[in-house]
Amino acid sequence: LTCLGGFASPGPVPPSTALRELIEELVNITQNQKAPLCNGSMVWSINLTAGMYCAALESLINVSGCSAIEKTQRMLSGFCPHKVSAGQFSSLHVRDTKIEVAQFVKDLLLHLKKLFREGQFN
């Protein structure tokens, strides 16, 4: 990950360092997982496309009483600090499949690593 740390990207997009910090936090969660993450809580799966950070936040915020993912929730809020207006990113609340938080985190981590390798920080 480090070799892409200085990748320059135009416009208001999450800088590489912010993305790397989020990746590292997700890595910490997956590596330090002993008991089922968040007691096996289920969350809505999301489309890992446009509006992904807001969608991930909206999904994970439904897990309560799980300190292991609170930092992740707050870091995702860094990308998406104000509520998405109605009609914007309509996929945010498409709810059809639920998965365990642990699987959600793994899927998100894999996707973010892929974006990082490709230099896509938005």
């Epitope: 999450p14 809020s77 860094g78 998406c80 600090p81």
Partner: antibody, heavy 118, light 111 residues
């Protein structure tokens, strides 16, 4: 320990400009959104602007077009450029770490005073 | 804009007693079952401090004497039991709709 230190306040005439700065430490600055919130003398709190970790900006109508929020992640610094200042902009301006709409303004600086008067 | 009306404007409470502050929003601040209402404490000469987020969640490091409740348009901050150093102004704030707005504040004094 999270620390936010504002500077740049002072006395300015109506129509003038001022640039506020906020030096952040004790957390990974680049990973968090930041905001400015102000408090007029003896009054309540008013949200002034926010900026995401990626640089997206948000303003209320009261300052839109006059104020510009920006950040320098390399310097762990937040800025507020204030133009066309009015008497009603007189306030203590606080820099705050914004943990998003689900968590609120998690940490606040001590504030810097802006006085707009002729 | 969403208007937040706090009551009472001020109250005096004896140590050990309960203090209750209410915040009424001009429209619902709920978002998919989550109330986007937060509470702050501001002691004299100091910046505000986050106490409660999302109506009822205690921010890290805040004593359990503070609690929040409510949903939709009606919210409550409770301090029980009140201590001498709780003298401060308390503000509610909504983040459901831009522009984000604060209540007018409630001044709590300890008898």
């Amino acid at each position: 320990e999270v620390q936010l230190v504002e500077s740049g306040g002072g006395l300015v005439k109506p129509g003038g400009s001022l640039r506020l700065s906020c030096a952040a430490s004790g957390f990974t600055f680049i990973s968090y959104a930041m905001s400015w919130v102000r408090q007029a003398p003896g009054k309540g709190l008013e949200w002034v602007s926010s900026i995401s970790s990626g640089g997206n900006t948000y303003y209320p109508d009261s300052v839109k077009g006059r104020f510009t929020i920006s950040r320098d992640n390399a310097k762990n610094s937040l800025y507020l450029q204030m133009n066309s200042l009015r008497a009603e902009d007189t306030a203590v301006y606080y820099c705050a770490r914004l943990d998003g709409y689900y968590f609120g303004f998690a940490y606040w600086g001590q504030g810097t005073t802006v006085t707009v008067s002729s | 804009d969403i208007v937040l009306t706090q009551s009472p404007a001020s109250l005096a409470v004896s140590p050990g007693q309960r203090a209750t502050i209410t915040c009424k929003a001009s429209e619902s601040v709920d978002n998919y079952g989550k109330s986007l209402m937060h509470w702050y404490q501001q002691k004299p000469g100091q910046p505000p401090k986050l106490l409660i987020y999302r109506a009822s969640n205690l921010e890290s490091g805040v004593p359990a004497r503070f609690s929040g409740s409510g949903s939709g348009t009606d919210f409550t901050l409770t301090i029980n039991p009140v201590e001498a150093n709780d003298t401060a102004n308390y503000y509610c704030q909504q983040s459901n709709e831009d522009p984000w707005t604060f209540g007018g504040g409630t001044k709590v004094e300890i008898k």
